[in-house]
Interface confidence: low
């Protein structure tokens, strides 16, 4: 299994709908056709699969239909968004990047995101 | 159904050579990066080769670089290894066996066929 | 490579109960973990991937769980025709390595 270099910010807000995104870069070694992209949450030292989507050079990427995640990708880069996000889902968001297709594999994992999400406070009750 | 039939194992010498042939059906064999895998005496499994869907790449262990070869014959949906200067540690079963996602290279092996024993000894 | 460690290397246990088997792997591979299943005689069958999702066909008596370094596979109420050996394989990249496998007898 080959290393590859990948590389996300370190930290990023959500905004107040809970969505948050972020870019995952990939130095890529070879021509890769087909990439896959996981996001992975660790927290307490649990680690679990968020999403992930494969996709084809030039396409868009494909998630599940009821992923919490989109996203585009653009050369080495995937922009990557993660919706639906509470204040219990603060956490480090790691960005694990594969080049699938043709062989040799790559395998590179960034550092993490560490994604703060404050759930709004309600709002006051109004007359109008 | 997937169906997968190796064939051409035997008994064979220290450092000889024995090619091993496995027959798919069921599935469209070009759409699937396929492998080898072998099971020693003692019961352990090895991964032992794998190519590409097109043939184009492959990808082997340590252990057997330099001495096996893995192709393919996508008009015979027909899976090859070719072993050569073989050893007493390569007397084992080896399976043929496809891997589960058509388009991806490194995943697990959905489909193994029955095995073909090679048996290495003087 | 990653070394993969199974235990217990056998175990026996009757029709009806319940047995744990435990796969340890040398380094993170978050939850890129298959199990297989095979029978006297006969070749592997896959059982789980991704650490616990069921392939095709297999009964749900079967669970996968785990993630990191340390997975299990779980049989609820054994059946005659689950005694056999089980092996886990990470396909966590290159190469892919098995570990030494589990024999289930029956008691």
């Known amino acids: 299994c080959k290393a590859m270099h990948v590389a996300q910010p370190a930290v990023v807000l959500a905004s107040s709908r809970g969505i948050a995104s972020f870019v995952c870069e990939y130095a890529s070694p070879g021509k890769a056709t087909e990439v896959r992209v996981t996001v992975l949450r660790q927290a307490d030292s649990q680690v679990t699969e968020v999403c992930a989507a494969t996709y084809m050079m030039g396409n868009e990427l494909t998630f599940l239909d009821d992923s919490i995640c989109t996203g585009t990708s653009s050369g080495n880069q995937v922009n990557l968004t993660i919706q639906g996000l509470r204040a219990m889902d603060t956490g480090l968001y790691i960005c694990k990047v594969e080049l699938m297709y043709p062989p040799p594999y790559y395998l590179g994992i960034g550092n993490g995101t560490q994604i703060y999400v404050i759930d709004p406070e309600p709002c006051p009750d109004s007359d109008f | 159904d997937v169906k997968l039939v190796e064939s051409g194992g035997g008994l064979v010498k220290p450092g000889g050579s024995l090619k091993l042939s496995c027959t798919a059906s069921?599935?469209?064999?070009?759409?699937?990066?396929m492998s080898w895998v072998r099971q020693t005496p003692e019961k352990r499994l090895e991964w032992v080769a794998t190519?590409?869907?097109?043939?184009?790449?492959?990808s082997y262990p340590d252990s057997v670089k330099g001495r096996f070869t893995i192709s393919r014959d996508n008009a015979k949906n027909t899976l090859y290894l070719q072993m050569s200067s073989l050893q007493s540690e390569d007397t084992a079963m080896y399976y043929c066996?496809?891997?589960?996602?058509?388009?991806?290279?490194?995943?697990?092996?959905?489909?193994w066929g029955q095995g073909t024993l090679v048996t290495v000894s003087a | 490579d990653i070394q993969m460690t199974q235990s217990p290397a056998s175990l026996s246990a009757s029709v009806g109960e319940t047995v744990t088997i435990t796969c340890r792997a040398g380094e993170n591979i978050y939850s890129y973990l298959a199990w297989y299943q095979q029978k006297q005689g006969k070749s592997p069958q896959l059982l789980v991937y991704?650490?616990?999702t069921l392939a095709e066909g297999v009964p749900s008596r079967f669970s996968g769980s785990g993630s990191g370094t340390q997975f299990s596979l779980k049989i609820n109420s054994l059946q005659p025709e689950d005694f056999g050996s089980y092996y886990c394989?990470?396909?966590?990249?290159?190469?892919?390595?098995f570990g030494g496998g589990t024999k289930l007898e029956i008691k």
């Open positions: 991704n650490a616990r």
């Open positions: 394989q990470h396909h966590y990249g290159s190469p892919r390595t």
């Open positions: 190519i590409s869907r097109g043939g184009g790449y492959t």
């Open positions: 069921g599935f469209t064999f070009s759409s699937y990066t």
């Open positions: 066996a496809r891997d589960d996602y058509g388009s991806s290279y490194v995943h697990w092996f959905a489909y």
